[in-house]
Interface confidence: low
């Protein structure tokens, strides 16, 4: 009779990450008696993938029932696969020893590789905001996958950009890999709408790529525009100022009107409006007794955007020209819908 | 670790003063506006004054403005109040209290000291 | 100066129980609106921050939710060791103000 092969007819097997692997063996001959045990990798390292006589192994289900007397399929399946199985499968016979089974033939052996879905792209931008026409970094990260070919695409408002770096990790062999990547944008003052979008295809995703997203409104800071106008006068010796602050992002806006440099009103930006592109607009007015006042008033608005430093506008009030109110000694009304004490 | 002790409470008559302080430790002092809250026995919280880090911000609430002065030395890490004209509805127990961001004030305070008692009676 | 008025003053709930205590501004104050919780014979501890924010290491059972003038603060399975009473604070302008407080006791 001729002597008993392991057969695994399979040089390899590619499976997808969360499926069932199938590897097959059979052997030629009943004979010598004894039981088959699968391993991974070969050699004194080799790690113990099932036994047939004995142990636990929750994951592995064989094809046939390896208990009949005239069975010669070895076959195993292998459920929930995940990257970190892959590797070469050998499938060998023990024949009857005492006390110890002793190995008998192996298989050729089976490659497992493993098509693992990349993780869906984590966009983040950087730390602290920045202004327009500044360039800011924004990275991708993408992990787990398998194998190691993948296509990664920076977006900015579906606009390809082309000034990034990536890196697939690590360099050699790995049972999955991880792509880092990192993009270049400019800002401008438009992008508080704006998203960039990191886009990863791989073969797993068949054409569909994952995408990342990252909003340009948690990265941006629009820094306001100031304009101090006098309006026209709304009674007798009373000036009315306002302080246009114009298209700023975020929103936290803090606001402090002073007259000759004394402060005189302090204001937080609560009831704004927005415009089409996601910047704020917000007037703060103060009503200015000119007769409290002998001489000339600078009047300055000063505001605070987001915790930078103040940035203001001043306005020469002329009040020569008022005649003069005795026994007054208000200069400014808080007229704001906003009151915040000082001093 | 971040901390904040308060001293300088005590008992005074009506009409007295008295100088709180606030020493912190674990952060940089300089970079934090700083808050001072009191709680009346058996009442709620009450703001009473803020300075922002560099002092260019002071508020104050009505009920303490022109007798209170907050005041802060960054090299010495510390926060103040001096208290003057003290009345009897200023007995409460005073906290000293830190914003969490940085140079900016308006977020909150995430770090409170153990609070130093105040008692103003005759 | 904003009035905080904070609802209920008191409540006696069981473990495990949700716990819902609201806040409502006497005007608009967008998102800046701050809880915190105190311990007989403690300091304030900072809970929810602008609203809705978690501050870092408090336990999730603590949330916080809305916007504008009215604020929810809740507790969705008490614990023994809150035990407290509980405070809404807005920032949106100066004098801070403080809701009157929530007094939370165990059945």
């Known amino acids: 009779e001729e002597e008993l092969q392991v057969i695994q007819p399979d040089k390899s097997v590619l499976v997808a990450a969360g499926e069932t692997a199938t590897l097959r063996c059979t052997a030629t001959s009943l004979i010598p008696v004894g039981p088959i045990q699968w391993f991974r990798g070969a050699g004194p390292g080799r790690e113990l993938i099932y036994n047939q006589k004995e142990g636990h192994f929750p994951r592995v289900t064989t094809v046939s029932d390896l208990t009949k007397r005239n069975n010669m399929d070895f076959s195993i399946r292998i459920g929930n696969i995940t990257p970190a199985d892959a590797g070469t499968y050998y499938c060998v016979k023990f024949r009857k020893g005492s006390p110890d089974d002793v190995e008998f033939k192996s298989g050729a052996g089976t490659e497992l590789s493993v098509r693992a879905k990349p993780s869906a792209p984590v966009v983040s931008g950087p730390a602290a905001r920045a202004t327009p026409q500044h360039t800011v970094s924004f990275t991708c990260e993408s992990h787990g996958f398998s194998p190691r070919d993948i296509t990664l695409k920076w977006f900015k408002n579906g606009n390809e950009l082309s000034d990034f770096q990536t890196n697939v990790d690590p360099v050699g062999e790995s049972v999955s890999y991880s792509i880092h990547s990192t993009a270049k944008v400019v800002l401008t003052r438009e992008d508080v709408h704006s998203q960039v979008i990191c886009e990863v295809a791989h073969v797993t995703l068949q054409g569909d790529p994952l995408r990342g997203t990252a909003n340009l409104s948690e990265t941006i800071r629009v820094p306001p525009t100031l304009e101090v106008t006098q309006q026209p006068v709304r009674a007798e010796n009373q000036v009315n100022v306002t302080c246009q602050v114009r298209k700023f992002y975020p929103q936290r806006l803090q606001l402090t009107w002073l007259e000759n440099g004394n402060v005189s009103r302090t204001e937080t930006a609560s009831t704004v409006t927005e415009n089409k592109d996601g910047t704020y607009n917000w007037m703060s007015w103060l009503l200015v007794n000119v007769s409290a006042h002998r001489d000339d008033v600078k009047l300055t608005c000063q505001v605070e955007h987001d915790g930078q430093p103040a940035v203001s506008k001043s306005h020469d009030l002329k009040v020569s020209a008022h005649p003069k109110e005795q026994g007054s000694n208000t200069a400014a009304e808080n007229t704001g819908s906003n009151e915040r004490n000082i001093y | 670790q971040v901390q904040l002790v308060e001293s300088g409470g005590g008992l005074v008559k009506p009409g007295g003063s008295l100088r709180l302080s606030c020493a912190a430790s674990g952060f940089t002092f300089s970079s934090y506006s700083m808050h001072w809250v009191r709680q009346a026995p058996g009442k709620g919280l009450e703001w009473v004054s803020s300075?922002?880090?560099?002092?260019?911000?002071?508020y104050y609430a009505d009920s303490v403005k022109g007798r209170f002065t907050i005041s802060r030395d960054n090299a010495k890490n510390s926060l103040y109040l001096q208290m003057n004209s003290l009345r009897a509805e200023d007995t409460a127990v005073y906290y000293c209290a830190k914003e969490p961001r940085s140079y900016w004030h308006g977020y909150g305070m995430d770090v409170w000291g153990q609070g130093t008692t105040v008692t103003v009676s005759s | 100066d904003i009035q905080m008025t904070q609802s209920p003053s008191s409540l006696s709930a069981s473990v495990g129980d949700r716990v819902t205590i609201t806040c409502q501004a006497s005007?608009?104050?967008?998102?800046?609106l701050n809880w915190y919780q105190q311990k007989p014979g403690k300091a304030p501890k900072l809970l929810i921050y602008d609203a809705s924010n978690l501050e870092t290491g408090v336990p999730s059972r603590f949330s916080g939710s809305g916007s504008g003038t009215d604020f929810t603060f809740t507790i969705s399975s008490l614990q023994p060791e809150d035990i407290a009473t509980y405070y809404c604070q807005q920032l949106s302008n100066y004098p801070i103000t403080f809701g009157g407080g929530t007094k939370v006791e165990i059945k």
């Open positions: 300075i922002s880090s560099s002092d260019s911000w002071i």
């Open positions: 005007q608009d104050i967008s998102n800046y």
